[in-house]
């Protein structure tokens, strides 16, 4: 994304649909700041590097975050 996070919110639209953790390249959780008042969750997909903004309030997305953090804790020693 050309513009840096310090200027404005990254996400202008959001999705309630969860993504398959296996198709995720990266999952960024950006906390609120003076430039953006809410948490932003940005999923970068393996295919084409497509970015998808996820709704932090969605139950499905909350479940996705739990699944991803569980996966990470399994991997870490």
């Amino acid at each position: 994304i050309p513009l840096s996070r310090t200027v404005r919110c990254t996400c202008i639209s959001i999705s309630n649909q969860p993504v398959n953790p296996r198709s995720l390249e990266k999952l960024e959780i950006i906390p609120p700041s003076q430039f953006c008042p809410h948490v932003e969750i940005i999923a970068t997909m393996k295919k084409k590097g497509e970015k998808r903004c996820l709704n932090p309030e969605s139950k499905a997305i909350k479940n996705l975050l739990k699944a991803v953090s569980k996966e990470r804790s399994k991997r870490s020693p």
Epitope: I1, R8, I12, S13, P37, C53
Partner: antibody
Amino acid sequence: QVQLVESGGGVVQPGRSLRLSCAASGFTFSNSAMHWVRQAPGKGLEWVALIPFDGYNKYYADSVKGRFTISRDNSKNTLYLQMNSLRAEDTAVYYCAREGGYTGYDGGFDYWGQGILVTVSS
Amino acid sequence: EIVLTQSPATLSLSPGERATLSCRASQSVSSYLAWYQQKPGQAPRLLIYDASNRATGIPARFSGSGSGTDFTLTISSLEPEDFAVYYCQQRSNWPPYTFGQGTKLEIK
């Protein structure tokens, strides 16, 4: 199916105000960024304004900055464009459009209303 | 503000022929470019996004290519319903989102 229906257009004198509405259905309006785009008679497309899903930031073309205000009511699934200090050069068909991407860079305007004519004339 | 220049202004072709429309940006827009089709009295319709991805429901005869400053919309074999005005739009440096001036594709 996705539907966007504009209303509120008409003939108005220079210097006066008008408010356009765009009623949305068939998608989760509160999750979607929305735009206004206009087209003067016989001319090309001109982007007017953008409002993100939460209404926190708003963005405008220089030609309307300080005169037009974009807003939304997510409880009513409605987008608005308040147009003040209207000029003859604001005469155009005004379209509301849904943002199909998430960041404003990816995607495009994937659904459009049918358009509403605003004529500014004395 | 990024300026988009479309060429040619008018393209006269017959059904079944291949159409090649060009859009040039005044500075790099990476692959953040979209193409729209507009028929008289109708709203524009999204054809291509991110320079080369077909929007939902768009026939395979439409394809987009390019990155940086030079982009092309190709219609492989023209159907009667393809005669319309085509606009490119840059999404790299906003606000503002800017459109090209349009290419009119007319029946020869």
